[in-house]
Every structure is written in structure tokens, then in C-alpha cells.
Interface confidence: medium
């Protein structure tokens, strides 16, 4: 029997989007150019749901993870790597005391129960983001049957 | 100890400005994350958000009063203004100042001040 | 805007009881959301955010449950220090309250 899976192997699907977490380490650059490979981008956090999600992921794995968040272009002002702006609802993501710029840190990551800024030249695990397919009769995405990755609850 | 204070006049007049400054102590505004508040409640009624400033000057006003209101801050002094133009008896409430931690915890708020009664009238 | 509705508006209870008030978001706020109690003259008090996570020094009969854009604040037995009108707020798109719950002695 023929199953939709509106995500590719091994990645996570949740509210539309399909999610790969990395198994290696790259510095924020090169985590870029990682997701653009594979037809996706460095994660673009676009509501509170999907932050708790990929924080929940991040903190279970206990993993310090790159998202496509930076204040390269002008300290201070943080914008994603779609160029849209932070949000101002979305500060309350970060640690306390974050974020500091300590020694040019300019590119977010996960980092326990919320964000921090750190030095992008570092290299850390990374999530990528695409939507998923929509599973049409003629997608690709119909595949052999595939582990079902469960949403987690919310945080 | 952390503590917000309200100051500023018991009365008004219709059509006034009114100002009104909290004076905090035990944290800073300029620790990222941290931000005050002006929240307001007319007698008997329901609590009302009307302005935030955060660490970094970031100001946000409520939609339906953000022409008449002003926020700012004097880090150096622990102070954070609020002016509100053009007074009308609606506006009678008790103001109050509130702080939001920093923290991954979201932005709600920790610690009040006691609130000042503002009363508008001719 | 985003829209907080508590329900009831009023709540008569006895010492004792376990009592429980609604907060409904008129759009997802995730878990977003803190519970405050206030007395007569007094400002309010934080009790939960982050939708069940219960503020340093309140009561462990105090708790919070839901996400998305239905929550409950509960008092798993109320004492007679409870009695006081509580708010519900979310903070997921700027700052907004509920009309509040007066609970009162019944």
C-alpha cells in the first residue's frame, strides 16, 4: 500500500513544514548552505507554536542548534534569513541576559529553554525548514511506509 | 528587594496631559529582557495594558490609545514616564507599573507597583 | 487584537471547594498566558505563567493547565484567603486581560 508522507526520510513534520535536525556540526554559514542544498532554509520561526516545538526538540536532544536568525547586518537588530524582522512578541524567547553580543556574537541558536546569541564562526548542530508536499496523486512524496514522527505536546 | 512606585497628580482636568512616572529599584533596565509596563483600571472594571518599554527602548502601545500616549525611560534615574494627552473622565482608573523579568519564560509581569488614582474632572 | 474571555464572571464557592475558571484566546496563544489574583485595593499578584508554571512563593493548590487558546486556572481547595477576583492574560501578541472572576463566598 502506497502512504503519503508529506515529509522526506527523516525528516519531522509539523503544521505544514517538514523540519531536519542535523546529526553534524556547521558553523551559521555553512548550516545556510546546507538547507539550501536540500531545497529548504536555516529555520525561519514564524508563531509560538513552532517555537515551542523546535525548542522541545532542541532541549530534548540537548543539542545547542543554529536558527536563521542573525544582527549581521546592522548590530542590535536582529532579522531572519528571509529578511523578515523579529517580531516584537518573539524576545521573549531569549535566555536570561540574552542577548549579550559578547565577543561579536551575532547569529541565534537554541539553547536550553530559549535562545542565545553566539559567535557564528562556531559550529553546531542546525534545522532546516520547506513545506511539505501536499501529496498529491502524482507527488514524490508517496514513498514505502515510514516511521510516523509524532507531533510532541506542546511545552 | 524589588519595588515599582506611581507618582503623579490625583487629578486632572478634561483635555489635559496627564504624566506619570514609575520609580523602580532592585533591578535595571538595562538587563536584557527586562521591561515596565503601564497597565490601568477604572473602578470596578477590568485591568487594561497600555504601554511597554523594553531594555533596548523598544515602545509598544496599546491600539486604541497608542495617538495619546507616550512612554520613555531614564535608565540612570530607574525611571520609566508615561503621558497620556488629551484627558477625558473615562480615563479616571488607577495606573499601575509593572515589571517583566527577563527570562525564556515570556513576557508577563512579575512584580507591581501599589497604583496611583488618577481621577478626571472639571 | 487578541481577545481574552474568562468564564464565569462570578464564581460562589465555600472553603474547601475545588473551583475552576475558564480563559478562552480568540486565537492560539500557545501557552503563552499568566493568571494573576487581585484583592480589593491591591494591585494584582502573579500567580502562573507560562500557562501552568507556578510562580516562586504561591500555594501549590494554585495550578494552570491548557494551550492553544483554551486555559484553566484551578484551587484545588479554596481557602478563605482565596477569595479575590482573578485575571487571566495573554502575552503571545502583545498584552492583553480578561474581564476577570470574582470569586466570592457563597
Known amino acids: 500500500e502506497r502512504l503519503c508522507h508529506p515529509c522526506p526520510w527523516e525528516w519531522t513534520f509539523f503544521q505544514g513544514n517538514c523540519y531536519f535536525m542535523s546529526n553534524s556540526q556547521r558553523n551559521w554559514h555553512d548550516s545556510i548552505t546546507a538547507c539550501k542544498e536540500v531545497g529548504a532554509q536555516l529555520v525561519v520561526i514564524k508563531s509560538a507554536e513552532e517555537q515551542n516545538f523546535l525548542q522541545l526538540q532542541s532541549s530534548r536532544s540537548n543539542r545547542f542548534t543554529w536558527m536563521g536568525l542573525s544582527d549581521l547586518n546592522q548590530e542590535g537588530t536582529w532579522q531572519w534569513v528571509d529578511g523578515s524582522p523579529l517580531l516584537p512578541s518573539f524576545k521573549q524567547y531569549w535566555n536570561r541576559g540574552e542577548p549579550n553580543n559578547v565577543g561579536e556574537e551575532d547569529c541565534a541558536e537554541f539553547s536550553g529553554n530559549g535562545w542565545n546569541d553566539d559567535k557564528c564562526n562556531l559550529a553546531k548542530f542546525w534545522i532546516c525548514k520547506k513545506s511539505a508536499a501536499s501529496c498529491s496523486r502524482d507527488e514524490e512524496q508517496f514513498l514505502s511506509p515510514a516511521p510516523a514522527t509524532p507531533n510532541p505536546p506542546p511545552a | 528587594q524589588v519595588t515599582l512606585r506611581e507618582s503623579g497628580p490625583a487629578l486632572v482636568k478634561p483635555t489635559q496631559t496627564l504624566t506619570l512616572t514609575c520609580t523602580f529599584s532592585?533591578?535595571?533596565?538595562?538587563?536584557?529582557?527586562?521591561?515596565v509596563s503601564w497597565i490601568r483600571q477604572p473602578p470596578g472594571k477590568a485591568l487594561e495594558w497600555l504601554a511597554l518599554i523594553d531594555w533596548d527602548d523598544d515602545k509598544y502601545y496599546s491600539t486604541s490609545l497608542k495617538t495619546r500616549l507616550t512612554i520613555s525611560k531614564d535608565t540612570s534615574k530607574n525611571q520609566v514616564v508615561l503621558t497620556m494627552t488629551n484627558m477625558d473622565p473615562v480615563d479616571t482608573a488607577t495606573y499601575y507599573c509593572?515589571?517583566?523579568?527577563?527570562?525564556?519564560?515570556?513576557?508577563?509581569?512579575?512584580?507591581w507597583g501599589r497604583g496611583t488614582l488618577v481621577t478626571v474632572s472639571s | 487584537d487578541i481577545q481574552m474571555t474568562q468564564s464565569p464572571s462570578t464564581l460562589s464557592a465555600s472553603v474547601g471547594d475545588r473551583v475552576t475558571i475558564t480563559c478562552r484566546a480568540s486565537?492560539?496563544?500557545?501557552?503563552?498566558l499568566a493568571w494573576y489574583q487581585q484583592k480589593p485595593g491591591k494591585a494584582p499578584k502573579l500567580l502562573i505563567y507560562k500557562a501552568s508554571s507556578l510562580e516562586s512563593g504561591v500555594p501549590s493548590r494554585f495550578s494552570g493547565s491548557g494551550s492553544g487558546t483554551e486555559f484553566t486556572l484551578t484551587i484545588s481547595s479554596l481557602q478563605p484567603d482565596d477569595f479575590a477576583t482573578y485575571y487571566c492574560q495573554q502575552y503571545n501578541s502583545y498584552w492583553t486581560f480578561g474581564q476577570g472572576t470574582k470569586v466570592e463566598i457563597k
Open positions: 509593572a515589571r517583566t523579568p527577563s527570562g525564556s519564560y515570556g513576557r508577563y509581569f512579575d512584580l
Open positions: 532592585g533591578f535595571s533596565l538595562s538587563t536584557s529582557g527586562v521591561s
Open positions: 486565537q492560539s496563544i500557545s501557552n503563552w
